[in-house]
């Protein structure tokens, strides 16, 4: 069951008392009436904040990144951690708070005029150095318009999937990330059995396209766990 810890940064449309009206005719959106809040007090403070398990930075909040909570800790146990402010040490861009990026192991301000050039320079100079790669955010988030004005084609370097053209996602390729095609029906996909395991992939695949999910191929049910083949199949 889900515990009810309300994130104080995201309070929106506080609902009317239970049993309130279910919306105003003529408007597409309304505040939420009659809500069931599991676990009691719906206004629990951020002090009761529970660590949020994650596999990649993109699953965290905008002011967080995904990492092991202890230095040199088990890579399989990762949670969302508060982002690092300017002049703090970093290993990748996602560790730095919004408005900053990671340069030479330190979070520095993203000067609007120079940011794109700095990022491209980082990719060129340190290809193969995992500590300065561009870690992505998400296949459903958007990138600041100050960085990229056109959507990347297949093979273009990207930060996150919204940098890529329609039908492409941003996936790891060696120690960088590039736009790759979203998987179609019947194509082999990666099913991650262990949380965080796709952080280890050098050649990451995209997710399955709309209406498809990554499932074990029917004729491979008898195969051993290690050799099971997963493909994109209709729901």
């Amino acid at each position: 069951t889900l515990n009810s810890v309300l994130n104080s940064n995201a309070i929106k449309n506080l609902p009317p008392p239970l049993g309130g009206a279910a919306g105003h005719p003529g408007s597409a959106v309304s505040a939420a009436p009659g809500i069931l809040y599991p676990g009691g007090n719906k206004y629990q403070t951020i002090d009761n904040y529970q660590p949020y398990p994650c596999a990649e930075d993109e699953e965290c909040g905008t002011d967080e990144y995904c990492a092991s909570p202890t230095r040199g800790g088990d890579a399989g146990v990762q949670i969302c951690l508060a982002c690092r402010k300017r002049r703090k040490r970093c290993m990748r861009h996602a560790m730095c708070c919004p408005g900053n990026y990671c340069k030479n192991g330190i979070c520095v301000s993203s000067d609007q005029n120079h940011f794109r050039g700095e990022i491209e320079e980082t990719i060129t100079e340190s290809f193969g150095n995992d500590h300065s790669t561009l870690d992505g955010y998400s296949r459903r988030t958007t990138l600041s318009s100050k960085m990229y004005h056109t959507k990347g084609q297949e093979g273009s370097v990207c930060l996150r999937s919204s940098d890529c053209a329609s039908g492409l996602c941003c996936a790891r390729h060696f120690w960088s990330k590039i736009c790759k095609p979203v998987l179609k029906e019947g194509q082999v996909c990666t099913k991650h059995r262990r949380k965080g395991s796709h952080g280890l992939e050098i050649f990451q695949r995209c997710y399955c396209g709309e209406g498809l999910s990554c499932r074990i191929q029917k004729d491979h049910h008898q195969a051993s766990n290690s050799s099971r083949l997963h493909t994109c199949q209709r729901h």
Partner: nanobody, 128 residues
Framework: EVQLVESGGGLVQPGGSLRLSCAAS????????MGWFRQAPGKEREFVGA????????TYADSVKGRFTISADNSKNTAYLQMNSLKPEDTAVYYC?????????????????????WGQGTLVTVSS
């Protein structure tokens, strides 16, 4: 301004399937979690499930796990709720909802209704 319009509701027999759609506009779809809630007659609104802004994390209520599937199509700014093996107790008004990616995310962020903007709802009736 966030606008959410649900469609696909209707009458279905027990054991049947329905697919609800939620067309979103007025915001950057990829920066929001898309959730589904429902409210049965005389009951409180309850969390059904949600897909996060990354599309990687999908959460379901225990009552629908294994029967319902949530997905989102960025290119169409649309979220979906595929409902299979429907039961009479699934009868309710189903609401699509959108919650922005917060600065800090907690375990219960997706099931906490006050984080969301809401659609008008679509009625699903499961009856023979």
């Amino acid at each position: 301004e966030v606008q959410l319009v649900e469609s696909g509701g209707g009458l279905v027999q027990p054991g049947g399937s329905l697919r609800l759609s939620c067309a979103a506009s007025g915001f950057t779809f990829g920066d929001y979690a898309m959730g589904w809630f429902r409210q049965a007659p005389g009951k409180e609104r309850e969390f059904v499930g949600a897909i996060d802004w990354s599309g990687r994390r999908i959460t379901y209520a225990d009552s629908v796990k294994g029967r319902f599937t949530i997905s989102a199509d960025n290119s169409k700014n649309t979220a979906y709720l595929q409902m299979n093996s429907l039961k009479p107790e699934d009868t309710a008004v189903y609401y699509c909802a959108a919650a922005p990616r917060p600065k800090r995310v907690s375990v219960s962020y997706f099931s906490t209704a006050s984080n969301y903007d809401w659609g008008q709802g679509t009625l699903v009736t499961v009856s023979s």
